[in-house]
Amino acid sequence: AILGRSETQECLFFNANWEKDRTNQTGVEPCYGDKDKRRHCFATWKNISGSIEIVKQGCWLDDINCYDRTDCVEKKDSPEVYFCCCEGNMCNEKFSYFPEMEVTQPTSNPVTPKPP
């Protein structure tokens, strides 16, 4: 292990579409992958008229977009489906939205997930 890196071994798991996908609805997911590759957690959600609806949470394969991110933060401006990834066990329990705007200051929209 590289000093200072949070190794991801498990992530919070949630699937709003669990019946169609034939998975569990919620739980803890152990993360698998090639032994030399990094592993991450992710969260995806929608903002329906100001109401946060979680789509999925789980493990994410080696991705340089996620390196050294201890917090799960979406930075894209108003995506159709919000996505964030992070490193560290269960780092996807909390996720937030900090859009990167060119002119105005970024606004913080922290999200506390409440799976149904």
Partner: antibody, heavy 115, light 111 residues
Framework: QVQLVQSGAEVKKPGASVKVSCKAS????????INWVRQAPGQGLEWMGT????????SYAQKFQGRVTMTRDTSISTAYMELSRLRSDDTAVYYC????????WGQGTLVTVSS | QSALTQPASVSGSPGQSITISCTGT?????????VNWYQQHPGKAPKLMIY???KRQSGVSNRFSGSKSGNTASLTISGLQAEDEADYYC???????????FGGGTKLTVL
């Protein structure tokens, strides 16, 4: 073991569209990206675009903007690449590959565009 | 993003070492550790050999190694064997904020 199995060869007329599928198994489909790459006969690899398999968000190479559409169906662990307004120079083998590092590849789908 | 530059061909005798270069710019190859190397035999799909400049993909022989200096990434194959004869492509990570690009490919001939 990780496998990406693509749909069979297609012959299309100029102006038509083609939709190639890529069925993933051996890993959690919604845990990475699917990239699409093509290779014209005797030529090199050309990146077409990528889809985030969990969120569905896409990024396309500028050359294919407006002609390519990448989608996925998470319930059957399958990604799709549709290319429209086909021309003869779209004749190529089309590959899907897993993840940002392209660590596993499909077997390829030959698309022939000919009048 | 413009294509990465590779030599069209290289050759070597069995047992020798060869190096294939992949040149980009200071804003891609030079500033990010995201270059990969792929091997492709005729009629087959490409195979990932090296990712992240210098990390060997699982199951790949340690005769294959990757490095980077400035804006140029390199693939070195030591102890050349007949089965190494193939086309080799460099390429970049693609996904999220990153767009993919490949080099033009290098044909390796084992003499």
């Amino acid at each position: 073991q990780v496998q990406l199995v693509q749909s069979g060869a297609e012959v299309k007329k100029p102006g038509a569209s083609v939709k190639v599928s890529c069925k993933a198994s051996g890993y959690t489909f919604t845990s990475s990206y699917i990239n699409w790459v093509r290779q014209a006969p005797g030529q090199g690899l050309e990146w077409m675009g990528t889809i985030n398999a969990v969120s569905g968000s896409t990024s396309y190479a500028q050359k294919f903007q407006g002609r390519v559409t990448m989608t996925r169906d998470t319930s059957i662990s399958t990604a799709y690449m549709e290319l429209s307004r086909l021309r003869s120079d779209d004749t190529a083998v089309y590959y899907c590959a897993r993840g940002g590092w392209f660590d596993y590849w499909g077997q390829g789908t030959l698309v022939t565009v000919s009048s | 993003q413009s294509a990465l530059t590779q030599p069209a061909s290289v050759s070597g005798s069995p047992g020798q070492s060869i190096t294939i270069s992949c040149t980009g710019t200071s804003s891609d190859v030079g500033s990010k550790n995201y270059v990969n190397w792929y091997q492709q035999h005729p009629g087959k799909a490409p195979k990932l050999m090296i990712y992240g400049v210098s990390k060997r993909q699982s199951g790949v022989s340690n005769r294959f190694s990757g490095s980077k200096s400035g804006n140029t990434a390199s693939l070195t194959i030591s102890g050349l064997q007949a089965e190494d004869e193939a086309d080799y492509y460099c390429g970049t990570f693609a996904g999220g904020d990153y767009y993919g690009v490949f080099g033009g490919g290098t044909k390796l001939t084992v003499l």
